[in-house]
Interface confidence: medium
């Protein structure tokens, strides 16, 4: 009624002393591997010469930190962040930071970054959008309240406001373009 | 560890300017927003205002013409001003820590304040 | 702006139920968190952004729900998870609201 070898899973690390041989009724727990945390129960227990049990790790990491507009990190770049881990952002001269100035690695996901917004008011270009451009030539600095249009390219179909306003600095949720469905 | 202690006067009289101190330990102003809530007599919670990490400062819009946050980050305090107070701003006060996505991990364990004559 | 609806309002249930507490919010969201109150305490976190466990609470807490549709779930009420329940939300281009709250009691 022994147990003999330890079964492996995938990113699981059995914790303690390996022995060649388990009694019935022994357990032995799992840690989970740098980048991945522990789904449910995390140990196995020997019953009539066999494990049950199944340590689940599940990746919760993250890559690539938000983009944010007029704004660049000043924490070390990593290829993959674990979850805890911060990443800081700083606003280019003039804008100012609304928000967050970390986002955090939280189970897989990024938590919501800053804005970076003019203090005066004024908009920097209005943010491209896949497969659409705006009607206007792009200027570098908009005045509050001004407002530009999007066109789709050819096919493409124009979801949402077509118009979108310089408001505190920041600009209104641009449109998209969106292939219609073929038949 | 991580705490937050709000104090102030308990009585405030109509029309006068409410103020209050959020004192923090265990973390620096410089890398945490604190948020100031307020919870009615026997009601839910109501966001008054943020002041950020960097130093800007958000409002509830209802609020936004009365209230100005501040922070000393020397002192590691968080201040709050409601200006022109009535009845209507009598509420158990609570400063919090952001965690991340706009949500608080830690809370002070709040004050009340009555406005009253 | 965003308003959170909860429900039920108040909710009666015995130690070992199973229990749901929904929030709906007005237009779809990314995020909500939820918080447990107990009287004369100040809110505590129970779930960060839809599903992750605050540090130290129980794993019979669970939070899940996308758009505008989110519950909070206990999976065996305990007799200390009698309190008043809030979700909350907000988001770059909306002011921070809470529900008005769920106050579970013993039935």
């Known amino acids: 009624t022994d147990c003999l070898s330890l079964p492996s899973f995938e990113n699981a690390i059995p914790m303690g002393e390996k022995k060649d041989v388990y009694k019935a009724g022994e357990q032995v727990t799992y840690t989970c591997a740098t980048y991945y945390k522990m789904d449910g129960a995390s140990n196995v227990t020997c019953i009539n010469s066999r494990w049950t049990g199944r340590p689940t790790c599940r990746d919760t990491s993250c890559v690539n930190p938000p983009t944010v507009q007029n704004a660049y990190i000043v924490s070390r770049q990593m290829s993959k962040y674990p979850s805890g881990e911060r990443v800081r952002y700083q606003c280019r001269s003039p804008y100012e930071m609304f928000g967050d100035e970390e986002v955090m690695c939280l189970n897989g996901n990024w938590t919501e970054p800053p804005q970076c917004k003019d203090s005066t008011g004024k908009c920097g270009p209005p943010p491209p959008i896949d497969n659409g451009d705006i009607t206007s030539f792009p200027l570098s600095v908009y005045a509050p309240a001004s407002s530009v249009e999007y066109q789709c390219q050819n096919l493409y179909q124009l979801e949402g406001n077509k118009r979108i306003t310089c408001r505190n600095g920041q600009w209104s949720e641009p449109p998209k373009c969106l292939h219609p469905c073929v038949i | 560890q991580v705490q937050l202690q709000e104090s102030g006067p308990g009585l405030v009289k109509p029309s006068q300017t409410l103020s209050l101190t959020c004192t923090v330990s265990?973390?620096?102003?410089?890398?945490?927003?604190v948020y100031w809530i307020r919870q009615h007599p026997g009601k839910g919670l109501e966001w008054i205002g943020v002041?950020?990490?960097?130093?800007?400062?958000e409002f509830n819009p209802s609020l936004k013409s009365r209230v100005t946050i501040s922070k000393d980050t020397s002192k590691n305090q968080v201040s709050l001003k409601l200006s022109s107070v009535t009845a209507a701003d009598t509420a158990v006060y609570y400063c919090?820590?952001?965690?991340?996505?706009?949500?608080?991990?830690?809370w002070g364990q709040g004050t009340s304040v009555t406005v009253s004559s | 702006d965003i308003q959170l609806t909860q429900s039920p309002s108040s909710l009666s249930a015995s130690v070992g139920d199973r229990v749901t507490i929904t929030c709906k919010a007005s237009?779809?969201?990314?995020?909500l968190h939820w918080y447990q109150q107990k009287p004369g305490k100040a809110p505590k976190p129970l779930i960060y952004?839809?599903?992750n466990l605050a540090s130290g609470v129980p794993s019979r807490f669970s939070g899940s729900g996308s758009g505008t549709d989110f519950t909070l779930t206990i999976s065996s009420l305990q007799p200390e998870d009698f309190a008043t329940y809030y979700c909350q939300h907000r988001s770059s281009s909306n002011p921070l609201t809470f529900g008005a709250g769920t106050k579970l009691e013993l039935k």
């Open positions: 265990g973390f620096s102003l410089t890398n945490y927003g």
């Open positions: 002041v950020w990490s960097g130093g800007t400062t």
């Open positions: 919090a820590r952001n965690f991340g996505n706009y949500a608080m991990d830690y």
């Open positions: 952004a839809t599903s």
């Open positions: 237009s779809s969201v990314t995020y």
